[in-house]
C-alpha cells in the first residue's frame, strides 16, 4: 500500500522571500528504493487554472523547472519527498501537488501554499494645517500581503486598568498596491491634546494574517505636547 501525507489542514503559510519546504511524506509497506521510484511536484496558480510542473525526480534523473527547486535524495530514502523552494514570491502561492510513483502504484496529495508579507509600521506626527491643541498622528503600515489588514487605535489612561479602543476621530485610508504586489495603508488619529490627560499612552495596533501578535507603535501624551516616546515593553517601529 502506498500513501502520501501533506501538511495537516491542507494549507501551509510562508513568509515572502523565505526558503519554504512544502511537506510531502511517503508511507509504503516496504523499504523505498529511490532508483525505482518517481516524484513529480506540480503547481497550480491562484489566478489561472493550469497546472505547471515544478520538479521531477526519476531514478538517477532530476530536473527543476522552477529555479532552485529541490527534493533531497537522502531524505527521499526515508520517505520524505518534501519540496524546497528558495526565495518564495507572492505569485508562487497556489496549489502544490506531490505525485509519487512506486511502480505499479501511484499516490498523490495536494496542499495550498499561502505567501504572506508582514507589515512594517511607523508613527508620524503631522501638525501641518492643524488648529492649536490639535494634533494628527499617522500610523503607516507598509509592505504587507494579503491586502486584508486591521488597524485600530487604543489609549491607556493612567487610572484605568485596561486599554480603551478609540473609534472617534480615526480615519483609515484606502490600501495602496505597491509595484511588488504588497500593500500600504495609513490610519490617522486626530487628538485634542488639551482634553487628554498627560501620561496617557496611545497605540496604533496593526493586526494582519502574517503576524502572530499585533504590531504596536506607541506615543505618550506629555505635558509638553507632541512628544513621541517609547514606552515600557513597546516595540517602536519609527
Amino acid at each position: 500500500d502506498l500513501k502520501v501525507e501533506m501538511m495537516a489542514g491542507g494549507t501551509q503559510i510562508t513568509p515572502l522571500n523565505d526558503n519554504v519546504t512544502i511537506f510531502c511524506n511517503i508511507f509504503y509497506s516496504q523499504p523505498l528504493n529511490i532508483t525505482s521510484m518517481g516524484i513529480t511536484w506540480f503547481w497550480k496558480s491562484l489566478t489561472f487554472d493550469k497546472e505547471v510542473k515544478v520538479f521531477e525526480f526519476f531514478g538517477d534523473h532530476q530536473e527543476a523547472f522552477r529555479p532552485g527547486a529541490i527534493v533531497s535524495p537522502w531524505r527521499l530514502k526515508s520517505g520524505d519527498a518534501s519540496l524546497r523552494l528558495p526565495g518564495i514570491q507572492l505569485e508562487e502561492a497556489g496549489e502544490y501537488r506531490c505525485e509519487v510513483v512506486v511502480t505499479p502504484l501511484k499516490a498523490q496529495g495536494t496542499v495550498q501554499l499561502e505567501v504572506v508579507a508582514s507589515p512594517a509600521s511607523r508613527l508620524l506626527l503631522d501638525q501641518v494645517g492643524m488648529k492649536e491643541n490639535e494634533d494628527k498622528y499617522m500610523c503607516e503600515s507598509s509592505g504587507f500581503y494579503p491586502e486584508a489588514i486591521n488597524i485600530t487605535w487604543e489609549k491607556q489612561t493612567q487610572k484605568f486598568p485596561h486599554p480603551i479602543e478609540i473609534s472617534e476621530d480615526v480615519i483609515t485610508g484606502p490600501t495602496i498596491k505597491n509595484m511588488d504586489g504588497t500593500f500600504n495603508v495609513t490610519s490617522c488619529l486626530k487628538l485634542n491634546s488639551s482634553q487628554e490627560d498627560p501620561g496617557t499612552v496611545y497605540q496604533c495596533v496593526v493586526r494582519h494574517a502574517s503576524l502572530h501578535t499585533p504590531l504596536r507603535s506607541n506615543f505618550t501624551l506629555t505635558a509638553a505636547r507632541h512628544s513621541l516616546s517609547e514606552t515600557e515593553k513597546t516595540d517602536n517601529f519609527s
Partner: antibody, heavy 117, light 107 residues
Framework: QVQLVQSGAEVKKPGASVKVSCKAS????????MNWMKQAPGQGLEWIGG????????DYNEKFKGKVTMTVDTSTSTVYMELSSLRSEDTAVYYC??????????WGQGTLVTVSS | DIQMTQSPSSLSASVGDRVTITCKAS??????VAWYQQKPGKAPKSLIY???NRYDGVPSRFSGSGSGTDFTLTISSLQPEDFATYFC?????????FGAGTKLEIK
C-alpha cells in the same frame, strides 16, 4: 520586567490593624496608578481603592472608606494599604494591581490576611 | 455602582467542548469590559479587554463579544489548562466592579 511583590501573610485579632505592602520594580514607579483588590475565601473580587503613585491622589470604594488608608513611599517604590478595626469579614487575600499595556494588567502575588480571635 | 451579573456560576465541560460565559451589566458600559481567568491560589490573569480584544499571548480559542450591557466570553475548544474560574469586570467608571465568577470544571 514589571514585578509587584507583596508582604507575607498576616494573622490578626479582631479590632487590630494590618499594613500590607506592595513593592514595585521594573518601571517608572511614580507615573502609575495602583489599585487594591479584595478576594474573600471562595468569593469574587472587589475593588477597594487606588492611589496615584506620585502620592497626589487616592480614590476609595465607598464601602471601604474609614476602613482603609493607602500611602506611598516613592523612595522605596512601595505602596501600603492599612486596614483598621479588623473583623472576621476582613479575612481575605488582598492584591495590588497596576495597569498593564498589551499583556494585561499586573498583579502582586496576593497577601492573605486572617482575622481570628 | 454598576452591577455585573455573571452566568452560569458553575459549568461542567469536557476537553474539546465549546463554552460560553455571559455577563450582564446593570447599565450601559460601552465596550469597557475585561475578562479574567483565575486558577486556585493564583492571582487573576487578564484575557480580554475592550470586550473583544485579546491580550497578547492569550490563545485564539478565547474570544469576547458584546457591547452596552450584554457580554460573552467564548472558549472555542476547551484545553486541560482552561479549567479555572472566570470573571468579567467593567472599567468604564470607578468603583471597578466584577462579576461573581464562573467556575469551569471538568465533566
Amino acid at each position: 520586567q514589571v514585578q509587584l511583590v507583596q508582604s507575607g501573610a498576616e494573622v490578626k485579632k479582631p479590632g487590630a490593624s494590618v499594613k500590607v505592602s506592595c513593592k514595585a520594580s521594573g518601571y517608572t514607579f511614580t507615573s502609575y496608578w495602583m489599585n487594591w483588590m479584595k478576594q474573600a475565601p471562595g468569593q469574587g473580587l472587589e475593588w477597594i481603592g487606588g492611589i496615584y503613585l506620585s502620592g497626589e491622589s487616592t480614590d476609595y470604594n465607598e464601602k471601604f472608606k474609614g476602613k482603609v488608608t493607602m500611602t506611598v513611599d516613592t523612595s522605596t517604590s512601595t505602596v501600603y494599604m492599612e486596614l483598621s478595626s479588623l473583623r472576621s469579614e476582613d479575612t481575605a487575600v488582598y492584591y495590588c494591581t497596576r495597569r498593564g499595556d498589551y499583556f494585561g494588567d499586573f498583579w502582586g502575588q496576593g497577601t492573605l490576611v486572617t482575622v481570628s480571635s | 455602582d454598576i452591577q455585573m451579573t455573571q452566568s452560569p456560576s458553575s459549568l461542567s465541560a469536557s476537553v474539546g467542548d465549546r463554552v460560553t460565559i455571559t455577563c450582564k451589566a446593570s447599565q450601559n458600559v460601552g465596550k469597557y469590559v475585561a475578562w479574567y481567568q483565575q486558577k486556585p491560589g493564583k492571582a487573576p490573569k487578564s484575557l480580554i479587554y475592550s470586550a473583544s480584544n485579546r491580550y497578547d499571548g492569550v490563545p485564539s480559542r478565547f474570544s469576547g463579544s458584546g457591547s452596552g450591557t450584554d457580554f460573552t466570553l467564548t472558549i472555542s475548544s476547551l484545553q486541560p489548562e482552561d479549567f479555572a474560574t472566570y470573571f468579567c469586570q467593567q472599567y468604564i467608571s470607578y468603583p471597578l466592579t466584577f462579576g461573581a465568577g464562573t467556575k469551569l470544571e471538568i465533566k
